[in-house]
Interface confidence: medium
Amino acid sequence: QPPPPPDATCHQVRSFFQRLQPGLKWVPETPVPGSDLQVCLPKGPTCCSRKMEEKYQLTARLNMEQLLQSASMELKFLIIQNAAVFQEAFEIVVRHAKNYTNAMFKNNYPSLTPQAFEFVGEFFTDVSLYILGSDINVDDMVNELFDSLFPVIYTQMMNPGLPESVLDINECLRGARRDLKVFGSFPKLIMTQVSKSLQVTRIFLQALNLGIEVINTTDHLKFSKDCGRMLTRMWYCSYCQGLMMVKPCGGYCNVVMQGCMAGVVEIDKYWREYILSLEELVNGMYRIYDMENVLLGLFSTIHDSIQYVQKNGGKLTTTIGKLCAHSQQRQYR
Amino acid sequence: SAYYPEDLFIDKKILKVAHVEHEETLSSRRRELIQKLKSFINFYSALPGYICSHSPVAENDTLCWNGQELVERYSQKAARNGMKNQFNLHELKMKGPEPVVSQIIDKLKHINQLLRTMSVPKGKVLDKSLDEEGLESGDCGDDEDECIGSSGDGMVKVKNQLRFLAELAYDLDVDDAPGNKQHGNQKDNEITTSHSVGNMP
């Protein structure tokens, strides 16, 4: 290995390295053989030491992480912002839908308030929780709404002479509601529409939140030591030879990056599928698959269902009178 | 008297942005999001190229660094030599993705499966029967007189500016226990700051 020329110093390298690591003791005064180096393997004398090499590796991995974060910043912001906006919008839709329904009860069936408000409130609370991922069954939510409403409708509108809120008859009436299909096909209709629209809404929000998670994961990837070595060799080893202004070759950079990102690039196939599947879902979000549409029209369907009960009131009162006779007798005692 | 903190239909925000010419619907916002996301469809496959283009790379210089020496930009050595005596790039690729990446791939597979099962098949009429069944006139039959409703045509009177329940001394929201006689619900009052309504009493 030839000795360095007599006028060679590591001055330039030293001033650059000082910016990375204040304190100059790691930079040789003049080029050295560098036999202890593991990454920037010298062809001749070098201005790098083992300690400098370690610092370069650390810096290279940090650079890579920052580059990755800046690459995903716009995408991350896009999904985070939209996830928040849609979640808030859906909550507002639910609140408006509840208000519509309460208005319908207050102005058409004042005798059913305030109990109806309570049941409506519970129903829409469950709707909100379901959208946010709660483990609630939509059919159960709808059944609970109609199960709760019917005893109030029966005791307040159809048979107002009965004493209120006696658990015995309420339980019997809840059972009768399903057995006698008191509300006709309306509960089933609401179940279908609400479950379809809420499922789609829920999965839409879940998908957006997963999108954020995907970006966050790749954003905070820690690169392997092997990758750190490759990056150091590409970005910093030229400095050891005093080549401060030279840049890596483009093709070489691509090869290194593909090596470092081999694992990350494997996400590509599933990411593409994610966007295309989300597009398909969004294209289908209308009519009964659009929760705004369904929830904001619920007041009307619930009104129709109560009218259905009223229409069949005479027959129902007779049948229920027999069916729940035992409970009623116990009440009158 | 207590007021219900939210109007049925109108939100003060409408009044503030009434001058805006183009208003977005939720569905148009969804479609816009998809269009923007589609511009990122190659995000992961393009990452290596993105990072190279955003880090110092020889573009106009005649000479460039290949990891070992200074070479001419278009020479065979420009891409090849830098990888010699280093470690096997193929080995690096063979290691497979990081555990966190594998986890996220599994989650993506799962959500993709869910999205596919939830998507409405193309060309399918969207449950037309369900969409319309029982919705036009309830189940009242042809004779509308059969329908008994406390306001005949099903109209709902809503108090002043559609703020209903104005006379009630308690809030309707079940966040408060029934019977709690409060002036407005704390939770909804918080909402009113950003989603308040018409002219409040």
Epitope: I92, L296 | F9, K12, K13, E23, D153, S194
Partner: nanobody, 123 residues
Framework: QVQLVESGGGLVRPGGSLRVSCAAS????????MAWYRQAPGEQRESVAA???????IYIDAVQGRFTMSRDNAKNTVYLQMNNLKPEDTAVYYC?????????????????WGQGTQVTVSS
């Protein structure tokens, strides 16, 4: 391009009647709960009535019993029949979707405001 065009307004004496229409293009309004709004000079825009996709309507007290909102899905149009008009009904009447939900600077489900139709009730 979504467009809502209101028409049918005019000058009418107290106690008179008018029927205003709102024709939509570029959107199928049969899937929306639609509403009529009005704005009197110097006043805030207020909602007057709404009609669900199934034809059920809701009204504010000030117009209850005098106004009737209806829709013709085949014509993609909603109507507001105004009877027994009063001077306080004087305003520009607009239609839009009822679920006009605003969130800060993000706005949704509004179909965009039309030019409105002027209703003047005066003797």
């Amino acid at each position: 391009q979504v467009q809502l065009v209101e028409s049918g307004g005019g000058l009418v004496r107290p106690g008179g009647s008018l029927r205003v229409s709102c024709a939509a293009s570029g959107v199928d309004i049969s899937t929306y709960t639609m509403a009529w709004y009005r704005q009197a000079p110097g006043e805030q825009r207020e909602s007057v009535a709404a009609i669900s996709t199934t034809g059920r309507s809701i009204y504010i007290d000030a117009v209850q019993g005098r106004f009737t909102m209806s829709r013709d899905n085949a014509k993609n149009t909603v109507y507001l029949q105004m009877n027994n008009l009063k001077p306080e009904d004087t305003a520009v009447y607009y239609c839009n979707s009822a679920d006009d939900l605003k969130i800060g600077t993000q706005y949704f489900k509004g179909l965009g405001w039309g030019q409105g139709t002027q209703v003047t009730v005066s003797s």
